[in-house]
Amino acid sequence: EVEKTACPSGKKAREIDESLIFYKKWELEACVDAALLATQMDRVNAIPFTYEQLDVLKHKLDELYPQGYPESVIQHLGYLFLKMSPEDIRKWNVTSLETLKALLEVNKGHEMSPQVATLIDRFVKGRGQLDKDTLDTLTAFYPGYLCSLSPEELSSVPPSSIWAVRPQDLDTCDPRQLDVLYPKARLAFQNMNGSEYFVKIQSFLGGAPTEDLKALSQQNVSMDLATFMKLRTDAVLPLTVAEVQKLLGPHVEGLKAEERHRPVRDWILRQRQDDLDTLGLGLQG
C-alpha cells in the first residue's frame, strides 16, 4: 500500500502521458486521478512504466472499482493485465470477444497462466456456451485449449462449433474428452459424403464406439495407424481381423510395428491365430 500524501504543487496529472514515468510511486498515487486513468487506459501501454509504477496504477483502479473493473477499462488494460490476480478477474464481466482477444494478445507466446484460465472461464460462462467464434479465438492462441476442459465443460460446446476445431487442437485430449466431442462431431458432419466425412471426423475417432468403426470399415477409408492407435481400446477389441483389415486398407502392415502397444496388443491377444495369420504379418496372439 502506498501512503496517502498530498500531491506537490504543479504535479497534478492532466492526462496520462510520458511525463509520469518520472513520478515516484507516492507521486503517482497522489497526483493521478483514478477516473482520469480509467478513461485514458489505452495510453498506459504506450508508456514504459516500471512494474512498481504499474502496481500503483492497478491500486488506483482497484480503489475506483472495488466490485470489479468495467469492460471499457478491461479492454485497454494491456500489460497491466499481467498484474491481475485470478481473484481480481473473477469480479469482471467480460462479454466482448474483442476484449478477450486484446487480453490474450498480452499473454501471447506464454503458457496459459492462472489469470488467462480464469479470464476464459469467466468469458465462456458469461456466454453460456463455447460458440464457434470463441473457440476459433481460443484455439488460435492456445491449440491445447479444448483438451484443457473437463468433459462437463465440453458438454456446453454446440455441434456447430466443431467446425472450428483443427486436428492439432485435439492432440492432448484424453478418451473421456473425446467421448464427449465425438457425438457432436458426428452430428456436425452428418451431411457430408463418405470421403469428406472421414477427413473431418478422423481427429475425433478416439471417442467412436465399435459400431461406428465397423461401419467405417465398410467404406474403404484406409485409416492410418496414427488414427487407429488413438481409438478407444474397448471399441477396438470387438473388431474382427477382417474388419481391421478393411478399416486400415494398405496401412494394415503397420500393425506389426505397433504389436507391443495398446490398443493393438490387446486386440491381437483376442484374435484366433488362424485369423491373424491371414494378414501375413507374423502377429502372435
Epitope: D174, R176, T233, D234, L237, L269
Partner: antibody, heavy 119, light 107 residues
Framework: QVQLQESGPGLVKPSETLSLTCTVS??????????WSWIRQPPGKGLEWIGY???????NYNPSLKSRVTISVDTSKNQFSLKLSSVTAADTAVYYC???????????WGQGTMVTVSS | DIQMTQSPSSLSASVGDRVTITCRAS??????VNWYQQKPGKAPKLLIY???SLQSGVPSRFSGSGSGTDFTLTISSLQPEDFATYYC?????????FGGGTKVEIK
Amino acid sequence: QVQLQESGPGLVKPSETLSLTCTVSGGSVSSRDDLWSWIRQPPGKGLEWIGYIYYSGSTNYNPSLKSRVTISVDTSKNQFSLKLSSVTAADTAVYYCARDFVLSGFDIWGQGTMVTVSS
Amino acid sequence: DIQMTQSPSSLSASVGDRVTITCRASQSSRYYVNWYQQKPGKAPKLLIYAASSLQSGVPSRFSGSGSGTDFTLTISSLQPEDFATYYCQQSYDASYTFGGGTKVEIK
C-alpha cells in the same frame, strides 16, 4: 467379487527356483478382458512388474527378468503361477499377483507374500 | 522400455493441502498411465486409470491429467487417510513400468 490369493514357500535357497501360485476366486482366469500379472516389491523399495499371462497362454515378461521367468495358467484350477529360476538375495521381495483389467489397470491385487532368498 | 520418472520422491504436507505429484515418461505413453496408492504392509490400490479416469469407489478429491509424456496426480484437499506412497505406471508398451514412488508424509 474377484479375489486373488498368493501361495508358496516363504524361504528359497540361492540358485534354486522360486515357485508361487495365485488362486482366483469370484471370477474366471479365462476372462477375455483380463491379463494376470506378477509384481514384486523388495523391502523398502518400489514396485517392479515381472510379467503377465492371458488365458490363452500368451505371456509377456519384464526384459530384465525374461531369461529366468516362466508364468503359466491352469484354467481348470482357476490359477496362474510364477517360476523364477536361479534366485539370489536380490530376489527377496513381497510378491503380488494382480488382475490387469484391459480397460483400466491393476484393479485387483492379492495381499502379497514375502519370499526371502537365503541359505 | 519406457522409464517413468516420478517427482518429488517425497513431500511433507498438512491436512487440507492441495498436493500434486508428477510423472514423466521417457517416451510417449499416450494416455495409458495409471496411479496407485500404497500404505505400509498393504497391497497397492488403483486410484486413476487411463491418465484421468477415477477408479470406482475412489474419492473425487483424487484426479489425474496428462497425455504423451507428462502426467499429474492431484489430491485437492489432503485427508489423514491419504498419507501413503503413490506410484504411476504405464501400460502403453507391453513391458509395463512403474515410477519410483512418491511418499506423502505429515508435515
